[in-house]
């Protein structure tokens, strides 16, 4: 049910990366506005993005309260300029989103190689521990803080002069790898949550190569 001049939202889709979480939907409004509500399975509905003409709503502030909870959102449609109007059943028209569990479903953002340091035939490659919008005790948590040992990184590395690649894994944000003396290497990393069944891997980081400014070389 609903008013005669409103249409229900459809294609409700969660877009989430490193817990920055936006609900998107269609259609672009014509003579109508939207309000979004979000709730955990057992909680109360909270309204967000009141009477908006946008077709997206940033729900990050709500889901970061507990990223392991499962959330449901719904989008209400109202006639523009008459938001008190309801449908014949006494309720505005609305559509439910799919369920969303941030810890299990947020996409892993593209990682960044923070630095690499060569000492003799060893190279230490450090991955930037990206800050998320998840808070604990008024401080923002990093990706590692949130996921702990559930998060691993895969490193791909190769000699600049050849195509043969090697790989390594770490459950910290650092790799210590063996390299051939006098050779320059290139590096790329990928974040992985092996326990997941979807959204398991990030895209690869930008490639960083030795001999460029990001690294440091020390002969010992």
């Amino acid at each position: 049910s609903g008013t005669t001049n409103t249409v229900a939202a459809y294609n409700l889709t969660w877009k989430s990366t490193n817990f920055k979480t936006i609900l998107e939907w269609e259609p672009k409004p014509v003579n109508q506005v939207y309000t979004v509500q979000i709730s955990t399975k057992s909680g109360d509905w909270k309204s967000k993005c009141f009477y908006t003409t946008d077709t997206e709503c940033d729900l990050t502030d709500e889901i970061v309260k507990d990223v392991k909870q499962t959330y449901l959102a719904r989008v209400f449609s109202y006639p523009a300029g008459n938001v008190e109007s309801t449908g014949s059943a006494g309720e505005p028209l609305y559509e439910n989103s799919p369920e969303f569990t941030p810890y299990l479903e947020t996409n892993l953002g593209q990682p960044t190689i923070q630095s690499f340091e060569q000492v003799g035939t060893k190279v230490n490659v450090t991955v930037e521990d990206e800050r998320t919008l998840v808070r604990r005790n008024n401080t923002f948590l990093s990706l590692r803080d949130v996921f702990g040992k559930d998060l691993i990184y895969t490193l791909y590395y190769w000699k600049s002069s050849s195509s043969g690649k090697k790989t390594a894994k770490t459950n910290t944000n650092e790799f210590l790898i063996d390299v051939d003396k006098g050779e320059n290497y290139c590096f790329s990393v990928q974040a992985v949550i092996p326990s997941r069944t979807v959204n398991r891997k990030s895209t690869d980081s930008p490639v960083e190569c030795m001999g460029q400014e990001k690294g440091e070389f020390r002969e010992i």
């Epitope: 791909y156 090697k166 790989t167 390594a168 894994k169 459950n171 990928q190 092996p194």
Partner: antibody, heavy 117, light 107 residues
Framework: QVQLLESGAVLARPGTSVKISCKAS????????MHWVRQAPGQGLEWIGG????????MYDPKFQGRVTITADESTSTAYMELSSLRSEDSAVYFC??????????WGQGTLVTVSS | DIQMTQSPSSLSASVGDRVTITCKAS??????LSWYQQKPGKAPKLLIY???SLADGVPSRFSGSGSGTDYTLTISSLQPEDFATYYC?????????FGGGTKVEIK
């Protein structure tokens, strides 16, 4: 459910090449890594190499470098392993396996490759 | 390359025995170690992943322990279906390497 179905047994001449396929079902191969392992008669397991179907990166044991090519076709959910310049000591059962990041958790049934003149 | 030294290479045991198999890596592999059971003519079957986690459907008599360079697979009470060959695998860095295998036979 997750399954890896390998192509059938192969008899090959020394010096030729063999290409084995591994058809995945029950998961999206680009979300995982795909590896190849072989086992000669009465011997242990030997890693040949692996591939990340999401970005095309392939890694090989240096022992096979230059002789092996591991690829994946996301559109058909199939991983491939091609081994060239075959010799008699390449006679073995070849397994494909899915790597979750924590382990090789699912394996194909194995493909017997016999190299003989 | 990381070497994996698995011991013993074979052992004889009776049903109900406690069996321990060890793998030692030549360098720290950060728990990227898994254990497999293989029976003749079959593909390996995952038992333990990430050094200590029991794979789905694997009986609780199997357990894994260890960190750094030293890892152990324990079968608390050997059952008739456990007579097989067991392998460890390090996948912390390429080339990935298997242990040489442990054949568990009936005494």
């Amino acid at each position: 459910q997750v399954q890896l179905l390998e192509s059938g047994a192969v008899l090959a001449r020394p010096g030729t090449s063999v290409k084995i396929s591994c058809k995945a079902s029950g998961f999206n191969i680009k979300d995982y890594y795909m590896h190849w392992v072989r086992q000669a008669p009465g011997q242990g397991l030997e890693w040949i190499g692996g591939n990340d179907p999401a970005n095309g990166h392939s890694m090989y044991d240096p022992k096979f470098q230059g002789r092996v090519t591991i690829t994946a076709d996301e559109s058909t959910s199939t991983a491939y392993m091609e081994l060239s310049s075959l010799r008699s000591e390449d006679s073995a059962v070849y397994f494909c396996a899915r790597d979750s990041g924590y382990a090789m958790d699912y394996w194909g049934q194995g493909t017997l490759v016999t190299v003989s003149s | 390359d990381i070497q994996m030294t698995q011991s013993p290479s074979s052992l004889s045991a009776s049903v109900g025995d406690r069996v321990t198999i060890t793998c030692k890596a030549s360098q720290d592999i950060k728990s990227f170690l898994s254990w497999y059971q293989q029976k003749p003519g079959k593909a390996p079957k995952l038992l333990i992943y990430y050094a200590t986690s029991l794979a789905d459907g694997v009986p609780s008599r199997f357990s894994g322990s260890g960190s750094g360079t030293d890892y152990t697979l324990t079968i608390s009470s050997l059952q008739p279906e456990d007579f097989a060959t067991y392998y460890c695998l390090q996948h912390g860095e390429s080339p990935y390497t298997f242990g040489g295998g442990t054949k568990v036979e009936i005494k």
